[in-house]
Amino acid sequence: IWELKKDVYVVELDWYPDAPGEMVVLTCDTPEEDGITWTLDQSSEVLGSGKTLTIQVKEFGDAGQYTCHKGGEVLSHSLLLLHKKEDGIWSTDILKDQKEPKNKTFLRCEAKNYSGRFTCWWLTTISTDLTFSVKSSRGSSDPQGVTCGAATLSAERVRGDNKEYEYSVECQEDSACPAAEESLPIEVMVDAVHKLKYENYTSSFFIRDIIKPDPPKNLQLKPLKNSRQVEVSWEYPDTWSTPHSYFSLTFCVQVQGKSKREKKDRVFTDKTSATVICRKNASISVRAQDRYYSSSWSEWASVPCS
Amino acid sequence: RNLPVATPDPGMFPCLHHSQNLLRAVSNMLQKARQTLEFYPCTSEEIDHEDITKDKTSTVEACLPLELTKNESCLNSRETSFITNGSCLASRKTSFMMALCLSSIYEDLKMYQVEFKTMNAKLLMDPKRQIFLDQNMLAVIDELMQALNFNSETVPQKSSLEEPDFYKTKIKLCILLHAFRIRAVTIDRVMSYLNAS
């Protein structure tokens, strides 16, 4: 058993049919010695008396808020949560496996630049009685500070018969140098509590590996005289690290017909303009990627040819 | 990444082309190592990230762009005088360049070159003949060092009398390639910045 926060405790349980329970001794936080009784949750029934209560925690029916009282007055609370371990593996019932980029990916993180700011998100089908708390650091043995905000519900989607909820959190490394070469990864730890179930999820990454620039901005077409060609121009996204001559991007320009089956023409360039042939009803899209370190491409920025 | 990239004009900052070749070569070599050594811990997640130049050179700090000198987190061990020698700087105003930048890059290349050559000598003794260093990568390191044109003492190649542990050597190769790729990215950024100045 360990303390998650004040008056909230996590009991770690091996979860198999003939597993023994965990013996837990609860102590009432009071100088009083006599006349103390214990109750659980909303029930007014007395579970035991005395300054300590020894319980066997085996089921979610044994978890909950234990309260000690004296003469009708509440003295203290202890909320017990359960953390299940099945076949030596901690349970992952609360979050959905996003399976990208690999199986058992519960947390996904992205950064728009090298400033040390990043966003992580996760998915669940649970809609109520759910809380998250996020901690992060650079390295684990001698951790350096990363500050994370509160996790918030960022999207709701219908997936077949189920509703899916996306939560996200923004974190900022306390003293980040955009030009630094990372040797210690960022560690992100998410505590998830659903009703009386506790689970924790972790992700470890280098900012350089989770970079995904915003799409190029101000995408414009300039027709070239007496030609089907157009000059496409764009700019670096505002959120990209500066100076741009140091943090350079490379671009992919794509001409896509109305039909998905039509052949796509693609050009790669380090410049912020390109000359392409604009077909009728086609659209021109541009996306960006770090020029020197191949992490993710940005989403496409698009304009119609017409 | 096999993308069409224009060859730089001869008038360009001379080292940019070499640094781009370096990054391409080390990335290809790392990819080859990851594929060949698929049963070894050779991915970014599996290896320990060691920097053989740590405490010996200060490339990141010395080559910091002017715009980032206002960022206190970037100013750990920065020098502030400016570089004046080295042929890469020919006909370029280099007021943004901090002391030791290009010489620091040169020292990095020299250290990695020695490590890679020593390692290659060991790998050539491996009866499995599983992996060797790409000669192209070693040649590109050499070319960039020549372009930087710093006069520096030659470092003798390390020689070892004991029988090499090939498993450890291959893991060390992965660690070295990952670190060198990261340094090659920094070098490319610096050269690109220099070129634009």
């Epitope: 049919p17 003939d18 597993a19 023994p20 329970g21 013996m23 837990v24 659980l40 949750d41 909303q42 029930s43 029934e45 579970l47 035991g48 209560l53 020894t54 319980i55 066997q56 925690v57 085996k58 089921e59 979610f60 029916g61 044994d62 909950g64 234990y66 009703k195 | -």
Partner: antibody, heavy 119, light 107 residues
């Protein structure tokens, strides 16, 4: 006052289905799991299993798994034990009981439902 | 499954007698043991839990002791209403199991 009131005695033929009930009152139904115990004529007590009234989480005795089904209706504070195809060997007294949290034993018992299966 | 063995299977005693019933577990169950009393035609009633804690409302003449594998239920001075069958139950490891019962009769 804590009370567990069980449905009346049943006489059934082999192969028939049956669902017996246990209605709870006098306490917070969702705080306490409900269990079932079998007592064959002239025999001792056998633990069938327990169930959470909150989310229908169930622990069956392997000996009874597949033979009986436990269920619960939170809105009426009622637990159920059912058979899809009765056998003569299911003839017994069935007790529902309230599981004590933080312990696991049964602190309050229903009066029992006698199930007789005979052709 | 854990086997619970009670002894004796039955015993005769008189009002005012001190009676001891024992229960042996086939493996260590800590203190997670309960005792129940059942009268003919009635549901069992909880007497003792955690090997030695009395259920509220149970007279003080009933006491439990033991831990691990050996447990006892003691009735210090038999009363006429105590003649019944007594069961022990371990609730440490699933499936929870009962002893075969000890029938206490009037001598």
């Amino acid at each position: 006052e804590v009370q567990l009131v069980q449905s009346g005695a049943e006489v059934k033929k082999p192969g028939e289905s049956l669902k017996i009930s246990c209605q709870s009152s006098g306490y917070s139904f969702t705080t306490y799991w409900i269990g079932w115990v079998r007592q064959m004529p002239g025999q001792g007590l056998e633990w069938i299993g327990i169930m959470s009234p909150v989310d229908s989480d169930i622990r069956y005795n392997p000996m009874f798994r597949g033979q009986v089904t436990m269920s619960v209706d939170k809105s009426s504070s009622t637990a159920y034990l059912q058979w899809s195809s009765l056998k003569a060997s299911d003839t017994a007294m069935y007790y529902c009981a309230r599981r004590r949290p933080g312990q696991g034993y049964f602190d309050f018992w229903g009066q029992g439902t006698m199930v007789t299966v005979s052709s | 499954d854990i086997q619970m063995t009670q002894s004796p299977s039955s015993l005769s005693a008189s009002v005012g007698d001190r009676v001891t019933i024992t229960c042996k577990a086939s493996q260590n169950v800590g203190s997670w043991l309960a005792w129940y009393q059942q009268k003919p035609g009635k549901a069992p009633k909880s007497l003792i839990y955690s090997a030695s804690s009395r259920q509220s409302g149970v007279p003080s003449r009933f006491s439990g002791s033991g831990s691990g594998t050996d447990f006892t239920l003691t009735i210090s001075s038999l009363q006429p209403e105590d003649f019944a069958t007594y069961y022990c139950q371990q609730y440490d490891i699933y499936p929870f199991t009962f002893g075969q019962g000890t029938k206490l009769e009037i001598k």
